[in-house]
Interface confidence: low
């Protein structure tokens, strides 16, 4: 339904608070080094100027595309060019190629300061004092350092912020109320934000036939007493949201989410039974519980798949009359029947479905020819089950810390190219999936561990992108989305791999790693691990062990030494030759 | 092989109800998509009503909006068309058609099985 003023339409359908907020959110995600205040000097003007429109929508340039009038906006600032360099090229393009550049400019990993949490007092005093900027800034940093974070759902993130501070900054404890629910806030954020960069890798990288086959797999796992009708329109319309999220577009997105939250509740009779709860939530919680539901109890008698799928005479005729709508049907049966199948992994046997009928259907004897596709099935299910089942061991044998050390090593070892930090950050995510998932029983382990490696090993992908340096990362992360984790399974040692110098400066440790947190003391000990493997790639695990063990005696011992920058001299020369010793280096 | 079998069309005057059924056979009848369409002398068939596999979603042409009603009884394999309001222009022989996996409900062309029609005239 077109309107005469896109602008004052979305201002009427969202209000003033979310449109402001969605804008700035949109700002910062696009010029991600500019200072809070110009962002919000930029947003007051489009604010002000959207309220013209809602007055008149035939006012001067009301008419124009929200990218138009964004774009014009974001142009405006006078240290584009020395900010951010070529971006500032986008402002000669026209719409839509100058958004489509925009969106080419977004850096996963940009080289802003770490957040620090200041003092619980300073904060609850900051908050008091203006609480309106202090959720703005919340958006803004976060928007700034996640600029695929899925906007609707940062707004529902900045409400449990206010909640948290409206709650606590009067509780006789202010701290132990609130320093909880900020730490809980920040993880979730972290893995909400990484989830929807998988979204956005799937369908700019991938396209919109790869997004909706993975959204009718996980909505019929979902829901899977709702008819293939259903499912079909629900993912229709969850990819709307998502390209138009992905692409810059959150004020649509925002409206089309709620439109969508809106539907699933008015027709929650056909959709699943789960719904209940959430629907008689608020927008923003609604939104959000709708898109965590359980999965709703899969229908009694199921007739078996074969039928359809295998026996019938028409598979073909059905095949090549409507492709992709029958695979899409196929999808669906399957995933409805396995809750315990990865979302990743329904697609791989979908996919193998579908290279059997095109290369049968051609076959002289078609029914013969795909009559045993189901058994190629079996291996692409058993590995998955056979990597948790012996990685969950190995958790349960290790622990996080020294699980997450393990593969630290394995990745090292993989991809010794991938720089320290990115090593280690990823490592340190792919190791939490033993505490995320490996406490589940059996039937919920696959669904949870392999789609949350899917979210994790994507983090690797896109901040290989930005500095591509190991030609064996490109290929996992380029060549198919639903491979990329037994692609990386299946590397080896990198045998090309020339190790690096040996820089004595790298294991130089000082006093300062005794004030850390533990989280911050493990980084340390693991950016070192990654450091010698990256040295002496052949180094077994027992050597490595040694190493590691001689090095936390070592920040043990001096953390509690009386002179301690005096110990981590002297101590640590002698570490370093020992490992030196130990290592053959 | 789905068999579909249409019964109930007959004469009746403007503004008279006339009620069609579909009996199915041969097939797991609550998986198929179930379709009414029609063809009048000399034009080409077209939409008229359509229902999804249980009984959630139904679809109707423009035209017989608010006049026709498909439902169907899965536990009887049968499909019904009730038609108020009848008007000289409905004057076709109405087929029952079946679809097992389908994109648009409106498209004859996404159904795999079709009955042999039932005559329906409109006349005073």
């Known amino acids: 339904d077109a309107h005469k003023s896109e602008v004052a339409h979305r201002f009427k359908d969202l209000g003033e608070e979310n449109f402001k907020a969605l804008v700035l959110i949109a700002f910062a995600q696009y010029l991600q080094q500019c200072p809070f205040e110009d962002h919000v000097k930029l947003v007051n003007e489009v604010t002000e100027f959207a309220k013209t429109c809602v007055a008149d929508e035939s006012a001067e340039n009301c008419d124009k595309s929200l990218h138009t009038l964004f774009g014009d906006k974001l142009c405006t600032v006078a240290t584009l060019r020395e900010t951010y360099g070529e971006m500032a090229d986008c402002c000669a393009k026209q719409e839509p190629e100058r958004n489509e550049c925009f969106l080419q400019h977004k850096d996963d990993n940009p080289n802003l300061p770490r957040l620090v949490r200041p003092e619980v007092d300073v904060m609850c005093t900051a908050f008091h004092d203006n609480e309106e900027t202090f959720l703005k800034k919340y958006l803004y940093e976060i928007a700034r350092r996640h600029p695929y974070f899925y906007a609707p759902e940062l707004l529902f993130f900045a409400k449990r912020y206010k909640a948290a501070f409206t709650e606590c900054c009067q509780a006789a404890d202010k701290a132990a109320c609130l320093l909880p629910k900020l730490d809980e806030l920040r993880d979730e954020g972290k893995a909400s934000s990484a989830k929807q960069r998988l979204k956005c890798a799937s369908l700019q990288k991938f396209g919109e036939r790869a997004f909706k086959a993975w959204a009718v797999a996980r909505l019929s796992q979902r829901f899977p007493k709702a008819e293939f009708a259903e499912v079909s329109k629900l993912v229709t319309d969850l990819t709307k949201v998502h390209t138009e999220c992905c692409h810059g577009d959150l004020l649509e997105c925002a409206d089309d989410r709620a439109d969508l939250a809106k539907y699933i509740c008015e027709n929650q009779d056909s959709i699943s039974s789960k719904l209940k709860e959430c629907c008689e939530k608020p927008l923003l919680e609604k939104s959000h519980c709708i898109a965590e539901v359980e999965n709703d109890e899969m229908p009694a008698d199921l007739p078996s798949l074969a039928a359809d799928f295998v026996e019938s005479k028409d598979v073909c005729k059905n095949y090549a009359e409507a492709k992709d709508v029958f695979l899409g049907m196929f999808l669906y049966e399957y995933a409805r029947r396995h809750p315990d199948y990865s979302v990743v992994l329904l697609l791989r046997l979908a996919k193998t479905y579908e290279t059997t009928l095109e290369k049968c259907c051609a076959a002289a004897d078609p029914h013969e020819c795909y009559a045993k596709v189901f058994d190629e099935f079996k291996p692409l299910v058993e590995e998955p089950q056979n990597l948790i089942k012996q990685n969950c061991e190995l958790f349960e044998q290790l622990g996080e810390y020294k699980f997450q050390n393990a593969l630290l090593v394995r990745y090292t070892k993989k991809v010794p190219q991938v720089s320290t930090p990115t090593l280690v950050e990823v490592s340190r995510n792919l190791g939490k999936v033993g505490s995320k998932c490996c406490k589940h029983p059996e039937a919920k382990r696959m669904p949870c561990a392999e789609d949350y490696l899917s979210v994790v090993l994507n983090q690797l992908c896109v901040l290989h992108e930005k500095t591509p340096v190991s030609d064996r990362v490109t290929k996992c992360c380029t060549e198919s989305l639903v491979n990329r984790r037994p692609c990386f399974s299946a590397l080896e040692v990198d045998e090309t791999y020339v190790p690096k110098e040996f820089n004595a400066e790298t294991f130089t440790f000082h006093a300062d790693i005794c004030t850390l947190s533990e989280k911050e003391r493990q980084i340390k000990k693991q950016t070192a691990l990654v450091e010698l493997v990256k040295h002496k790639p052949k180094a077994t695990k027992e050597q490595l062990k040694a190493v590691m063990d001689d090095f936390a005696a070592f920040v043990e011992k001096c953390c509690k030494a009386d002179d301690k920058e005096t110990c981590f001299a002297e101590e640590g020369k002698k570490l370093v030759a020992a490992s030196q010793a130990a290592l053959g280096l | 092989e789905v068999q579909l079998v249409e019964s109930g069309g007959g004469v009746v005057q403007p503004g008279g109800s006339l009620r069609l059924s579909c009996a199915a056979s041969?097939?797991?009848?609550?998986?198929?998509?179930m379709g009414w369409f029609r063809q009048a002398p000399g034009k080409e068939r077209e939409f008229v009503a359509a229902?999804?596999?249980?009984?959630?979603?139904?679809y109707y042409a423009d035209s017989v909006k608010g006049r026709f009603t498909i439902s169907r009884d899965n536990s009887k394999n049968t499909v019904y068309l009730q038609m108020n309001s009848l008007r000289p222009e409905d004057t076709a022989l109405y087929y029952c058609a079946a679809s097992r996996f389908t994109s648009w409900y409106t498209a004859d062309y996404e159904y795999d099985y079709w009955g042999q029609g039932t005559l329906v005239t409109v006349s005073s």
């Open positions: 229902i999804s596999q249980n009984s959630i979603h139904t």
């Open positions: 041969g097939g797991t009848f609550s998986t198929y998509v």
